[in-house]
Each structure stands twice: as C-alpha cells, then as structure tokens.
Amino acid sequence: RSQQDPPCGGRLNSKDAGYITSPGYPQDYPSHQNCEWIVYAPEPNQKIVLNFNPHFEIEKHDCKYDFIEIRDGDSESADLLGKHCGNIAPPTIISSGSVLYIKFTSDYARQGAGFSLRYEIFKTGSEDCSKNFTSPNGTIESPGFPEKYPHNLDCTFTILAKPRMEIILQFLTFDLEHDPLQVGEGDCKYDWLDIWDGIPHVGPLIGKYCGTKTPSKLRSSTGILSLTFHTDMAVAKDGFSARYYLIHQEPPENFQCNVPLGMESGRIANEQISASSTFSDGRWTPQQSRLHGDDNGWTPNLDSNKEYLQVDLRFLTMLTAIATQGAISRETQKGYYVKSYKLEVSTNGEDWMVYRHGKNHKIFQANNDATEVVLNKLHMPLLTRFIRIRPQTWHLGIALRLELFGCRVTDAPCSNMLGMLSGLIADTQISASSTREYLWSPSAARLVSSRSGWFPRNPQAQPGEEWLQVDLGTPKTVKGVIIQGARGGDSITAVEARAFVRKFKVSYSLNGKDWEYIQDPRTQQTKLFEGNMHYDTPDIRRFDPVPAQYVRVYPERWSPAGIGMRLEVLGCDWTDSKPTVETLGPTVKSEETTTPYPMDEDATECGENCSFEDDKDLQLPSGFNCNFDFPEETCGWVYDHAKWLRSTWISSANPNDRTFPDDKNFLKLQSDGRREGQYGRLISPPVHLPRSPVCMEFQYQAMGGHGVALQVVREASQESKLLWVIREDQGSEWKHGRIILPSYDMEYQIVFEGVIGKGRSGEISIDDIRISTDVPLENCMEPISAFAVDIPETHGGEGYEDEIDDEYEGDWSNSSSSTSGAGDPSSGKEKSWLYTLDP
C-alpha cells in the first residue's frame, strides 16, 4: 500500500451503528488493498446485520482479483456468507453469531467506486412478538398495531384448539409491504404472513399473504393453526389485525359426507378459485364459476381439453360429489356448457392424479344445457385439497359453474388427526424398521406436509418385514389411519421414486412391547387393508376403535417403485370415544325426498364405513380376490377347460404413460377369427354365503362385434344359475362389472364364461375380481343391461353355452394391460338413482 493511503480495517463494536467503506469511497478505491474488519456485538446472543449502499462497484472477473467477502465468525477460516464484486450490491447479511469478519481485496488493475455498508445490532423484535393462543377467542395483531410494524421481525402466532373444536380466523385489516410488480398471490418478497395448517414449517402451508388484499376467512379443524409474520429491514406498513374464535363441532348422528363445500355459498373464497386461463374480456373469470352464480361463469381464453378450473380447499377434505352447470352469456343470452370432464386431484398443488374408474381415466358426463345442474358422485370418496375440473367436450364453448360436495375427515366421530400432519406429533415420536437414508428425517413420514416420504432401506423387502411407527405420546382411542405414497430421489439412481403401499396391516400397543394386529371383524384374522393406487392421493382406512399409544403400519404389497409411505393416525382422546354408527357416504333416499339433479352412473361407495347386515357370517375363501398380477398360488381362480396358458407379460404400454401404476396383468381370451371360435371358463374357489349377500366387482373388456359374449354363472352341485351376461361388443374400454352374490345355503362356485363365435375375431378380458365390502348392495348392479328381467335357472350345468356351437378350445392367458383404451369404464347412464344433497 502506498504511503499516502489511509489505513483500512479494524475491530468495530456494533453497539453503535456505523459504516465501513472501501478506501476513498465513493471515489475509485486504490489498488493493492487488503483490508480486514471484525465487527462484534457486545452481547453473545446478539447478531449483526449488514446493509449495503446500492452504489456498489468492484471489478468483476468472477471476483478473482477485487472483491469483498463476509465470513460468519472472527477469522478467515469462518463460514463464508458471501463473496461479492460487480455492480450489484449484496443483499442484507445477518450473522448467526455475535461476530462478522469482512475482507476487501483489490489488485493492481481496474478500480471502481467500491462499497459502503452499514453495520448494526440485528434487532429482531421477535423475542417478544410470538404468542400462543388457547382461549375460546382472541385478537392477533402485528406488533405495534395500529402503528406501523417494526423491521426484521419473525413472529409466530399459534392457535391451539381442543379436539372437536374448529378454529375460525377472520382478518379485519391487512396491509403488508409487497412488490408492485408481483405476479401471483403468494409471490411475496419483502414482508409476508404465512398461515400453516399445524406447526410452522411442519404442517402444510395454507397460504402466503402480502399487499393489501385481506385473506379470506379460514376454518381449520386440525386442532392447530399457525401464523408466521416476517418483515425485512425496509418499508413498513400498517400491518394486520385478525380475530379468531373456536367453535365446537358436533356433527349430527346421521351425518352424511355430502355437504356443499362452499362454491355457491361463498365459503370457498375467491382467492381459492383459479384456472389455467380466463377469457380475455375479464367477464368470465374463475371466480364466476360458482353454482347458480347469476353473472356468466368461467370460460378459458381458448377452448381446449388442456384447460382447467381449480379449487384449493385449503385443508385435506373428503370429496364425494361434483355438481356442474353451464352458463348463459349476459352479453348474448347464448348458452355454453361442458358436456364431459375429467377430474384431477392433488394434496399439494403440484402432484396431480387423474381420477380413474378401474384402469381408465373417468370421463364424467356433465351438462346437456346451460342451466340445469348435473350431479356426479364419485364411486369412492377422495381425500384431497386441490381439485381440477378439466373439460373434455363442450357445447359452443367451455363455460362452467360448479359446486363440490363432501366433508372433512374430522367430521366423522373420533376421527381427529392425531398430529402427523400438523406436527403435534414430534419427529422423535416417529420411527421405522429401517430407512433408506443414513441420516433420516422422521418428518418425511408426515401425511401431506412432507414432500417426500418414508422409504425403507430395502425398497423390495419381504411382506410384513418393514414398518413405520408412531408414538402418540399418551394412550388414545385409535380408529383409523390415512396413508399416502411417497416421492423422492433415490440415493442409488437419480430417478425420483414414486412409490406407494398397495396393501398393509396395522398393529398397535399400549406399551411399545406387546403388539396386536387390527383384526377383520368378519374373519377374526389379521385385517389386510387396501392401500394406495397413486403416490400422492391419500386413502383413509378405518377400523373398530382400539386403545393404543403406539401404532405401526406394515406394508404387505407395494408399487413397482417399492415401499414408500406417509401417514396420519385418526382417533380421539381415550375418554372421548363412544360407539356410533358412521356413514360417510351420501345416502340414497326415496324419490319424493330427493333433489332434482340428474346423476352420473356411479353410486358413491363409502369406503371402510359400509357394512353388510350380517358381516360375521361372511367367510371369504382365500384367493377369491384376484388381480392376476401375482403367481398362481396367490389366486384361487382356476381354468378348467384346457391347459392354463400363461403368456409372456409383454406390455404394449408406452413406458412414459403411467396409465397403470402397478396392476399390469389380466386374463385374456382371444380369437383371431379361427374357424372353431373360442370358449373359456374361469372358476372361483368355493364360496359359502348362508346368510349374507355380497357384492362382487370386476373389470372387463369385450371386443369383437356380435360374436362375443361374457357371462357369470353360479354353479352349485345340482344347479347352475346365470347371474349376469353381456352379448355384444363393449368397445375397447375397460368397464366395471358388479354383481350381487345372493345368500345361498349350499357351497357354490362363480364361473366366468367367455365366448368368441366361430370365425370371429375378438377378445374378452377379465381383471380385478373381488368381493367389495365397500359397495351398498343397491349399487351392486353394473351394467344394468347385463341383468335380464327374469333369467331362467338352468340345471345340470347347462346354460348359455348350449347356444354355442360344439367345442371350443379355451385360451385364457395372462396378459399385460394395454394403454390404448382410455375411455370410460362404465357404460351409459345405467342408473336413475336420485341422491339427496341434504346432510
């Protein structure tokens, strides 16, 4: 350094704020500088904040020659917080401890104006701004309200409610600094308020808010709602004021999960409704998509099946039905409406699942005019937060008005979420048999709030070998679990695993040592629960209440990507539970009490909540439920007419098309037009149902014109009864069959008989045969056309096959699914049930 340059560097106490500049600032700094400053705070728990003057100019060249560097400590060996050059001033820098090291270096060549920074003690204001709220009502305000809020705040406000209490949060005023160029809601750069469903940064984020748009009323039934308030060191505004109150939730005894969720009423706020695009005149916005809204509806900018209307329900919600209308243009009085649509759901707004019926995307038949309401019920309720309606066909143009029906998980008796999602269950209470990552974060196993999930060390372990465990902290009454798949990069391959558990068992314990499995009340055997069909969409599985502090879930079968799981446990405090009858599915009522909404063909099933009148007598043979994906011993159905052929499982599916997550194989009877035709029988294990009728479900395809027939026969020792028959081409789509197996005092077998006539080309496929414990018997006739008014009984095993010429060589072979048929697996409008929408 030359003699005339003033010295630079030093040790500075930040008790009094001050400035550090490059020598000569704002004139060009000299060459050959090597300045070092140490800035320290007087108290060990204090931090230091540096704010740079925007007039910043240091020779660039990747900061090789001239630069300023800041380290999080008192020497050159401390962690680097930033190394800066060029002409863009660094952002605000805050130390983690009570000291910062700053170094400025210049070489012999080009110079610039240099830098100027202000240092001071970092005053958070946060030490005394965080609060917990437990009283029945209260006010939450930004610090100092109604005055402007302080800088550098990070405050947390947590509202805690007892079980069965709903938290309602209503903002009265709201004004936080925001970027005037901000594109979308939630793009908050400077000051913001985050609202969390649970503990901050653990539970799901409901929304991020800034600017002057007041957040709409929030209703949470998770038991904990948190707000985190962040402010920066610049502009301060008036802040916010909100009222909260707790309301006791007691659903009526006969509660049905078909409550309007709030499109028509406005309970779903405008900010929760969005779309892929909106018509450019601003008169057909997503916010105009409310059922019976009197001002147009939603219309996209261009009509295409890539457009969608989206609703964010904010919290995980059971969706059971969707009602749609078209809209009449105020400007022309012309009507526009959607004739069919697909449904997509997501728990996080990023991972979407197209709703299916069987193997195919379900295409819902919607409106036939612009004003009538058409209600489509889901054949299985969906647990979701985000919903997208994606129009497929329309009249004149897409126009949509909408209502959603359902309920919250917690509306059912003793169904509080016990804390995996919200974070009330701490990480230390979550454990597993093994984990893929060496340093595993137990938070990964949390329902929805985790972006990844739990993966065991061996993704293809033995059934029942791996488990995920939750310690509830104290004994609770446990009544169910919600399971969800998982996603995350594999440490071995760069591919993101999208895994889920297809079947599982649940065990429980009060002490962590003595374990019992949840039993199937019908068989008194360990219950094997149906799991997920997709890595994002969660499924609720309920069971009779058990006392437990520890709950374990054991995967038994899983997706090709292996075991992956996220979890929530449902229940209530040990003293809370009282036996009640639950029905979370919409009810069927007589016609005179129904609302006049035309119905889609699918009747709602009610998950684990339905039961038959006399379940204890149902003894299902092992191997009756069969999806033909596993080796023969797992499936009790036999082929009795010729040699069982297992063809190679060659998939014709596009590997990028995830049409079938796992269930890739099915039985196929095929004929290429040979002279003698085809005939094949598929026979169930023996069934004995002396008292209880049950519902048998299956998937089928039948292609080949008038030459194909598929029938289902009940064969007992002395007689045979035709139960179901289709006698013509059903198209290339997979369809859903349902048949009531009536009670019968003798043992019998179910036989599928497929026929392809002489010289005909065609194929008949069968898959996913199972007894459904979920479907009310009144909904167990599908398609209705397969049930003759009076099918005569036949004896001696002679039935419809008498109409078939001579002998056939049967060829049921195990085949892989093709993704070509993307139609609706249900045929036509087969049912005319009308459903009540009243709870």
């Epitope: 243009s329 022309t332 009085q333 009507g335 005019d369």
Partner: antibody, heavy 114, light 110 residues
Framework: QSVKESEGGLFKPTDTLTLTCTVS????????ISWVRQAPGNGLEWIGI???????IYATWAKSRSTITRSTALNTVTLKMTGLTAADTATYFC?????????WGPGTLVTVSS | AYDMTQTPASVEVVVGGTVTIKCQAS??????LGWYQQKPGQPPKLLIY???TLASGVSSRFKGSGSGTEYTLTISGVQCDDAATYYC????????????FGGGTEVVVK
C-alpha cells in the same frame, strides 16, 4: 338440422307482423335463435335473439316494437313487430345462433305498402 | 355499443387474384367475429367463426385473421363462384347495439 320461416306477405302500414320460425333436428333448449332482416338492395340487419334459456335481447331500434317468444315443445320461435312502416319491407330470416349464425332459413319476404 | 365498420364497400378482383376485406369494431370484440357470404336470392352462408376458424365444408382459400378491434377476411385464388356480398358479424355482445353486422362488401370477379 334446419330452420324455416313462415310465409310473409303484404302488410299495411301500422299492421302487426307475426312470423314463426320452425326448427328441426336440434332443441331450442340448447341453441339460441336470432331474427335478421334485409331490405331490398341493403345489408343484413339484426333484430334480436332468444337465448337457449329463454333470455331475450333486442336491437336498440327494435326494442320498442318487437317481441320474440318461443315454444320449446312445438320447436317454434315467433317474432311480432308492431307499427309497421314501408321501411320494414324486407326479407326476414331466422337463424340458429351457435358459435355464429350457422344455420339460416331461406327467408320470407314481407312487403309493407298502403 | 359495438358498431361494425366494413371496408371497402365494393371491390373488383380478377380470377386467381386475392381480395382482402377489413372489418373494424368500435371496441374490442375479443375475436368473437364471423364472416358470411351471401349470393342474390339466398340466405347468408357462414364461412368463418371465432375470427379464424373455418366453418365445415368451406374452402381453405378463405382465411380469417385479426384480434381486438381489427379483423380481416382474405380470399386467395379467387374463383368466379366467389362473386358475392361478404358480411362480418360480431358475436361478442348484443346489448345496446343497433346492428351486429358490418355494412357488407360486394366482391366482383372479372
């Protein structure tokens, strides 16, 4: 799918014109119908529309003396125009109004003369 | 009001030539515009809707374009049979309008 206007004819000034448009092959519950007229040697002039839900809009000049009604059961739309003058002499068309006027009737000539 | 101004009122074109007809709305009609062809003694025939979509059975020699307030119908490779009067029509708003049609353009083919 078609639309057809009833016969026009000769009318005297101050008379009331009643024309009926009969539709076939589609429903008036799903399509709107507009009335349009064309004076000899002139351009097309819109009179009004009845929407598929029954809402009606008239051109400003026609509002005071025109009435459009429909019968979905009979598949008919009726135009009534009062206080006819010689300026109302024109060919009257009814047209199905979908994404545009995609189906037109052949038209019917109405002459107003004393 | 949404007034439609069509230019020119008349145009001559030789067989094989190209003709361009313009339609201007007094305010944006957001591409809700149709074009019609009318021959003497016949009702109009729809050619183009939504500003640029060809109606079924219409020759691809007819092309519609434009957005906002400015729209164009272009007929290329003109044939004798194209001699007719052409009208534009706004389909955006019928409220408080005198007419939804433009004044018409007569195309004479030589």
């Amino acid at each position: 799918q078609s639309v057809k206007e009833s016969e026009g004819g000769l009318f005297k000034p101050t008379d009331t014109l009643t024309l009926t448009c009969t539709v076939s092959g589609f429903s008036l519950s799903t399509y709107s119908i507009s009335w349009v007229r064309q004076a000899p040697g002139n351009g097309l002039e819109w009179i009004g529309i009845i929407g598929d839900a029954g809402g009606i809009i008239y051109a400003t000049w026609a509002k005071s003396r025109s009435t459009i009604t429909r019968s979905t059961a009979l598949n008919t739309v009726t135009l009534k125009m009062t206080g006819l003058t010689a300026a109302d002499t024109a060919t009257y068309f009814c047209a199905r109004d979908g994404t545009a006027f995609d189906i037109w009737g052949p038209g019917t000539l109405v002459t107003v003369s004393s | 009001a949404y007034d439609m101004t069509q230019t020119p009122a008349s145009v001559e074109v030789v067989v094989g030539g190209t003709v361009t007809i313009k339609c201007q709305a007094s305010q944006s009609i957001y591409s809700k515009l149709g074009w019609y062809q009318q021959k003497p003694g016949q009702p109009p025939k729809l050619l183009i809707y939504r500003a640029s979509t060809l109606a079924s059975g219409v020759s691809s020699r007819f092309k519609g374009s434009g957005s906002g307030t400015e729209y164009t119908l272009t007929i290329s490779g003109v044939q004798c049979d194209d001699a007719a009067t052409y009208y534009c029509q706004q389909d955006y708003s019928y409220i408080n309008v005198d007419n939804i049609f433009g004044g018409g353009t007569e195309v004479v083919v030589k």
